[in-house]
């Protein structure tokens, strides 16, 4: 889980080792702060859980692409 030591900087120290179904993901944000030990992606699920993931993994990239497309699609 993400850890906010000195708010407002949130860092990830461990990544999930399981894929999260894209149907469960609501949004994401990238962690690129130099105050953090590693770059990360934090996914927020539909039940508001936050999960740290490795941006180098393909499933993470696919999930971000999927969420980006969802955001671009206008609601009918």
């Amino acid at each position: 889980q993400p850890d906010a030591i000195n708010a407002p900087v949130t860092c990830c120290y461990n990544f999930t080792n399981r894929k999260i179904s894209v149907q469960r993901l609501a949004s994401y944000r990238r962690i690129t702060s130099s105050k953090c030990p590693k770059e990360a992606v934090i996914f927020k699920t539909i039940v508001a859980k936050e999960i740290c993931a490795d941006p180098k993994q393909k499933w993470v990239q696919d999930s971000m692409d999927h969420l980006d497309k969802q955001t671009q699609t206008p609601k009918t």
Epitope: R18, S21, V22, A26, S27, I46, Q70, K75
Partner: antibody, heavy 119, light 113 residues
Framework: QVQLVQSGAEVKKPGASVKVSCKVS????????MHWVRQAPGKGLEWMGG????????IYAQKFQGRVTMTEDTSTHTAYMELSSLRSEDTAVYYC????????????WGQGTLVTVSS | DIVMTQSPDSLAVSLGERATINCKSS????????????LAWYQQKPGQPPKLLIY???TRESGVPDRFSGSGSGTDFTLTISSLQAADVAVYYC?????????FGQGTKLEIK
């Protein structure tokens, strides 16, 4: 395409334990979230538990807490469900079920394993 | 925990007629941001594992005949078979996958009248 192949039928005495296996092919086990669902004769589907990647842990239905253990052997791509202190009401078909990365529903099911508890 | 309740428990319908099964959840399974309800319908025939028919309350799984349709949102859902075929005799279950633990309805047995 995920395939789930379960171990064969078992007959157990009350008080004993049973361990049912579910071998995964087509995906690696760590890419999936394996769940177990049982069905007593003539009854409905009952979720027993499964791996929740959002909490990074195995979650068990309250009814089975302390009596069920779900484990994985990643080297053989096999998931296991062990139920202890068996009683006659545990006679049921036990299914493993999972979904792939693009889904959140149980699209893939094992063929089922009949466990009969009888003295 | 979310409790799923189906009605009726059993249903007898003539071939070619419409069959309607209802499912109610004790809490909403709708995620407002994507306006999707995390509700699935399964069909189970004797001696077989369940088969996914519909997800997100109304999206038909590929290969499922279009006589099957799902509707509803939030807490109230319906599975409709527009023209019953002999192959549709089975038990039907709804399931929520919005929150853990996931839960199934008790099932509705569909028979031919």
């Amino acid at each position: 395409q995920v395939q789930l192949v379960q171990s064969g039928a078992e007959v157990k005495k009350p008080g004993a334990s049973v361990k049912v296996s579910c071998k995964v092919s087509g995906y690696t086990l760590t890419e999936l979230s394996m769940h177990w669902v049982r069905q007593a004769p003539g009854k409905g589907l009952e979720w027993m538990g499964g791996f929740d990647p959002e909490d990074d842990e195995t979650i068990y239905a309250q009814k089975f807490q302390g009596r069920v253990t779900m484990t994985e052997d990643t080297s053989t791509h096999t998931a296991y469900m062990e139920l202890s202190s068996l009683r006659s009401e545990d006679t049921a078909v036990y299914y493993c079920a999972t979904h792939d990365f693009w889904s959140a529903y149980f699209y893939y099911w094992g063929q089922g394993t009949l466990v009969t508890v009888s003295s | 925990d979310i409790v799923m309740t189906q009605s009726p428990d059993s249903l007898a319908v003539s071939l070619g007629e419409r069959a309607t099964i209802n499912c109610k959840s004790s809490q909403s399974v709708l995620y407002g941001s994507n306006n999707k309800s995390y509700l699935a319908w399964y069909q189970q025939k004797p001696g077989q594992p369940p088969k996914l028919l519909i997800y997100w309350a109304s999206t038909r799984e590929s290969g499922v005949p279009d006589r099957f349709s799902g509707s509803g949102s939030g807490t109230d859902f319906t599975l409709t078979i527009s023209s019953l075929q002999a192959a549709d005799v089975a038990v039907y279950y709804c399931q929520q996958h919005y929150s853990t633990p996931c839960s199934f309805g008790q099932g509705t047995k569909l028979e031919i009248k």
